[in-house]
Interface confidence: low
């Protein structure tokens, strides 16, 4: 449905408030270093222009594509070259190459200061003084730090952020009301960003087919009563939405997501019995709710899969006629029967099935060749089951912090070339799988754990891609999206690694550690642990545990001392010497 003016079309569909918010997100995700005020100015200019196009779609430049309009606007930034260096070269290109160029320069780990939360009274005053600017600033700060954040979902977060301040800034105990809400939004926001980053990586690195396969499996688990044709339609629409958002087309993405939510709610009878509550909510809450909705009950008396996919004499004929449709049907049928499997496992099974048909349908006796294909699935299913069982036992034995430490040691030994901050961040997140998933019953553990691990390992992959230092990481990240976790699991200690030289400065601590939060103090200790392993990759668990216990005791002792700084200096030297002796450094 072609429109004379795309910008007018989106402005009318989305409304001024959402239009402005989405343009701000888009600009902040592209130009991550630009000051807030510059972005607000650009957004206001675009909005005024959009209004002229709404008034007269034939007005000058109103027929230009959104990429052209937004790109032209971004390229007016005076400090583009000194702030962004080679990104300024994008402006010499024509669309669509210019937008592709901007996309390639998105930085997953921008050099921006950590967001420090001001005092509650200061935040409430700022909120009351200028609510609009306060909320725009939230969108800007999140978008520039998370350049692939799912834009329509960020609008939902901003709505909750506003609600938190509206409620809590008039509460008797503002801090008790507000801080837990902000913590929850921060943690949910990080998780949402990482999940979306995996979707974009899937589309951009492995293509639309890979994303569609993921979507077929996930939606079939969620909507097992829906027909294959219905699931296929939802997959096509969902793929369009995410392709747009990952490609920076945020207005189209938000508009199409709203249309998809509307379609799902209008057709919920043929999709899922679990959608009723979601569909009664306002738009942003509705879309979020649908995305998180629990799996519907499986239809009773589903026939055995073997009949259609192994025993039928038409298997090769059906496969040859429409390979992707037949494989899609296999994936749909398998996934709707197995809400207890992770999506990545389902995709591995589908890949095994595809490989078997490719080989067998060219054989003299195809049926004889593929008759035992389901037997090949058993080891693929058992591998994640066993891994999750072992790791949940370890988590229950150690608790989250020590479980994270075990993973820190494990991953540092596997890929010691990776930067220490990345190893700490990724291993801490890997370790959170314990508290997130091990509490679930058996039937929910694997989808929770393995699909979460896929999200976390993708963080490692995108951070490593910026500065590749380990071909083992590159190999696991690029060879197969669904086999990333097994690839990393299979890595042993890197025997080729030359240990880092010992540097006492790395293990020198000061009194400021005493004022840190428990989480920040843990990160300091975990950073030291990674550095220890990099210096002594062959250190045993027992040796490392002894050193870390000494280190914890040292921090506790010096934080209780009257002259903390002297204690850290003197006791620190002793600790370094003792650690060197214990590890044979």
């Amino acid at each position: 449905d072609a429109h004379k003016s795309e910008v007018a079309h989106r402005f009318k569909d989305l409304g001024e408030e959402n239009f402005k918010a989405l343009v701000l997100i888009a600009f902040a995700q592209y130009l991550q270093q630009c000051p807030f005020e510059d972005h607000v100015k650009l957004v206001n200019e675009v909005t005024e222009f959009a209004k002229t196009c709404v008034a007269d779609e034939s007005a000058e430049n109103c027929d230009k594509s959104l990429h052209t309009l937004f790109g032209d606007k971004l390229c007016t930034v005076a400090t583009l070259r000194e702030t962004y260096g080679e990104m300024a070269d994008c402006c010499a290109k024509q669309e669509p190459e210019r937008n592709e160029c901007f996309l390639q320069h998105k930085d997953d780990n921008p050099n921006l200061p950590r967001l420090v939360r001001p005092e509650v009274d200061v935040m409430c005053t700022a909120f009351h003084d200028n609510e609009e600017t306060f909320l725009k600033k939230y969108l800007y700060e999140i978008a520039r730090r998370h350049p692939y954040f799912y834009a329509p979902e960020l609008l939902f977060f901003a709505k909750r952020y506003k609600a938190a301040f509206t409620e809590c800034c008039q509460a008797a105990d503002k801090a008790a009301c507000l801080l837990p809400k902000l913590d929850e939004l921060r943690d949910e926001g990080k998780a949402s960003s990482a999940k979306q980053r995996l979707k974009c990586a899937s589309l951009q690195k492995f293509g639309e087919r890979a994303f569609k396969a993921w979507a077929v499996a996930r939606l079939s688990q969620r909507f097992p009563k829906a027909e294959f044709a219905e699931v296929s339609k939802l997959v096509t629409d969902l793929t369009k939405v995410h392709t747009e958002c990952c490609h920076g087309d945020l207005l189209e993405c938000a508009d199409d997501r709203a249309d998809l939510a509307k379609y799902i709610c209008e057709n919920q009878d043929s999709i899922s019995s679990k959608l009723k509550e979601c569909c009664e909510k306002p738009l942003l809450e509705k879309s979020h709710c649908i995305a998180e909705v629990e799996n519907d009950e499986m239809p009773a008396d589903l026939p055995s899969l073997a009949a259609d996919f192994v025993e039928s004499k038409d298997v090769c004929k059906n496969y040859a006629e429409a390979k992707d449709v037949f494989l899609g049907m296999f994936l749909y049928e398998y996934a709707r029967r197995h809400p207890d499997y992770s999506v990545v496992l389902l995709l591995r099974l589908a890949k095994t099935y595809e490989t078997t048909l490719e080989k067998c349908c060219a054989a003299a006796d195809p049926h004889e060749c593929y008759a035992k294909v389901f037997d090949e699935f058993k080891p693929l299913v058992e591998e994640p089951q066993n891994l999750i069982k072992q790791n949940c036992e370890l988590f229950e034995q150690l608790g989250e912090y020590k479980f994270q430490n075990a993973l820190l040691v494990r991953y540092t030994k596997k890929v010691p070339q990776v930067s220490t901050p990345t190893l700490v961040e990724v291993s801490r997140n890997l370790g959170k799988v314990g508290s997130k998933c091990c509490k679930h019953p058996e039937a929910k553990r694997m989808p929770c754990a393995e699909d979460y691990l896929s999200v976390v390992l993708n963080q490692l992959c995108v951070l490593h891609e910026k500065t590749p230092v380990s071909d083992r990481v590159t190999k696991c990240c690029t060879e197969s999206l669904v086999n990333r976790r097994p690839c990393f699991s299979a890595l042993e200690v890197d025997e080729t690694y030359v240990p880092k030289e010992f540097n006492a400065e790395t293990f020198t601590f000061h009194a400021d550690i005493c004022t840190l939060s428990e989480k920040e103090r843990q990160i300091k200790k975990q950073t030291a642990l990674v550095e220890l392993v990099k210096h002594k990759p062959k250190a045993t668990k027992e040796q490392l545990k002894a050193v870390m216990d000494d280190f914890a005791a040292f921090v506790e002792k010096c934080c209780k001392a009257d002259d903390k700084e002297t204690c850290f200096a003197e006791e620190g030297k002793k600790l370094v010497a003792a650690s060197q002796a214990a590890l044979g450094l």
Epitope: Q104, Q204, E465, P468, E479
Partner: nanobody, 117 residues
């Protein structure tokens, strides 16, 4: 799967030139720094040269500075090494790798360069 296929090696006289190519597939070539590494008989691997993902930065081993030039064509997913003023000590198997690694990234066999009169 990651594939790196080197070509362009051969027998050349001292002072001669060769141009090596490395065709990449199975990963987003334009997003990665790349290296040329060589291994002479009975010696460990040596990184000859490396180039950043957008070709804005290059590194050369002291032994090849001023004689070798690394380049890339991201549109063609290809890495190049132009080798001039070749010397007998440049004799080795040359292979390309992802990042700054000195271990092969893919199943490529490398390409033999022999400098001899």
């Amino acid at each position: 799967q990651v594939q790196l296929v080197e070509s362009g090696g051969g027998l050349v006289q001292p002072g001669g030139s060769l141009r090596l190519s490395c065709a990449a597939s199975g990963f987003t070539f334009g997003q990665f720094g790349m290296s040329w590494v060589r291994q002479a008989p009975a010696k460990g691997p040596e990184r000859v040269s490396a180039i950043s993902s957008d070709a804005s930065g290059t590194i050369y081993a002291d032994s090849v500075k001023g004689r070798f030039t690394i380049s890339r064509d991201n549109a063609k997913n290809t890495l190049y090494l132009q080798m001039n003023s070749l010397k007998p000590e440049d004799t080795a198997v040359y292979y390309c790798t992802i990042g700054s690694s000195t271990t092969p990234s893919g199943p490529g066999q490398g390409t033999q360069v022999t400098v001899s009169s």
